[in-house]
Interface confidence: low
């Protein structure tokens, strides 16, 4: 009995996840199934024989990428009841041809918050552009946008930013650079300084539990889809 590779996938209530599965070389039926609690059997969720389980109709798609030897299953409009253990597989017998185990966890219990990230490749003279933007943290009831920062929720000391009130015109079809907050233009700093500032700002944001858990949302820890690393600088 061979041990299946395992992948963990996390998503938000109402959001969507993409499950990445290995594609066998020979052309056979491929599927995603869900393990039934208690019985141990795996019931087909979607397969290439045009089957879609009733409760997934209209919100699941299976796409094959033979050249990459993988197939992707996207599940949208996630509900808490979608949390569970799934398996990818190939073959006519759903219970027999499993190739990978997938644990899906759908979260809804936390408040997302804006998460700032340092930008290692930005020169220090580059002013923050601003058209639609929030300060790092405007006040105890103001905007912070990106998912989940660490620690306890609740009592957050207000941090006030003065801000420019000039409206930026937008006709040359280019978003102009401008300062963000305060009297002097704020500039990007070298990554080490920016990291320290980000860490400091993190202490001032509305905060939520299980930082490590939530910041991996929608990310498969194995078979990471795509080549992006954290270097994108976008939380």
């Amino acid at each position: 009995l061979r041990i299946l590779p395992e992948v963990k996938v996390e998503g938000e209530l109402g959001g969507s996840v993409t499950i990445k599965c290995p594609l066998p070389e020979m052309h056979v039926r491929i599927y995603l199934c869900r393990e039934m609690a208690g019985s141990g059997t795996c019931g087909t969720v979607v397969s290439t024989t045009n089957f879609i389980k009733a409760e997934y109709k209209g919100r699941v798609t299976l796409k094959q990428y033979p050249r990459k030897n993988l197939f992707l299953v996207e599940v949208t409009q996630l509900t808490e009841s979608d949390s569970g253990v799934y398996a990818c597989g190939a073959g006519m017998n759903t219970d027999r041809g499993k190739t990978q185990k997938v644990t899906l966890n759908v979260h809804s219990e936390y408040e997302p918050s804006w998460e700032e990230q340092p930008m290692p490749e930005t020169p220090k003279w580059f002013h923050l552009p601003y058209l639609f933007q929030m300060p790092a943290y405007a006040s105890s009831s103001k905007f912070v946008t990106r998912v989940t920062t660490p620690a306890q929720r609740g009592k957050v000391p207000p941090v006030h930013h003065s801000s420019p009130t000039t409206q930026i015109t937008h006709r040359p079809r280019v978003s102009r650079a401008s300062s963000v907050a305060g009297d002097k233009p704020r500039t990007f700093l070298p990554s080490t300084t920016a990291s320290k500032i980000s860490a400091l700002e993190g202490l001032l944001k509305p905060q939520t539990p299980s930082y490590n858990h939530h910041t991996r949302l929608h990310r498969q820890r194995a078979l990471d889809y795509g080549s992006q690393s954290g270097r994108e600088g976008q939380g």
Partner: antibody, heavy 125, light 112 residues
Framework: QVQLQQSGPGLVRPSETLSLACSVS??????????WGWFRQSPGQGLEWIGC???????YTNPSLKSRVSLSIDQSRQRFSLNLTSATATDTAVYYC?????????????????WGKGTTVTVSS | QSALTQPASASASLGASVKLTCTLS???????IAWHQQQPEKGPRYLMK???????SKGNGIPDRFSGSSSGAERYLTISSLQSEDEADYYC??????????FGGGTKLTVL
Amino acid sequence: QVQLQQSGPGLVRPSETLSLACSVSGALVTNTAYYWGWFRQSPGQGLEWIGCIYANGRTYTNPSLKSRVSLSIDQSRQRFSLNLTSATATDTAVYYCVRLVPKRTATLHYYIDVWGKGTTVTVSS
Amino acid sequence: QSALTQPASASASLGASVKLTCTLSSGHSSYAIAWHQQQPEKGPRYLMKLNSDGSHSKGNGIPDRFSGSSSGAERYLTISSLQSEDEADYYCQTWGTGIHWVFGGGTKLTVL
């Protein structure tokens, strides 16, 4: 299918309060997976973020407007609202309500996955 | 300096393909963007999120004719088999350290 239905007056007098509401169908305003927000687009201009509200009532606003903006959420009526006080001619714009979804792939971002149809508001005497 | 730059206009024939460009400014070449469509007299519509590696995830109901790709600081939106309803303004949008919902100026697409 999530839909956002906007309502509010098309004409507001200067110095009065601009009030708009956005009724949500197909999703709960209390759903902790979303933010609900407002943008506006002035004639010939780009889109400007006004503010957002979360299921628990926490509000976030554009710093350039924050002294005049108030946002609220009404769970029983399945809607969220925008009030912009001391309206001036520069507030003349098409106002959009939106739903924002956190999405993580290799990085996380918030994207607008549903837009209201927009309400044209003219501030004039 | 600008965060996002888009050509003011583009045109292509009915049934043909068109590739719209959004250029990220220096130091932002690794950023992902989102593409939005705004048809005349209508509100914007989310099309897709496009990563620096070219992978993308589309919004609900967005036809397969719309696809995204990336090269360096350039982000592309390709629309194939152009239809008359594709005539619209297309905005790219990004987010990042201290910048949120920054939109490019938009490209007005004319279908000939």
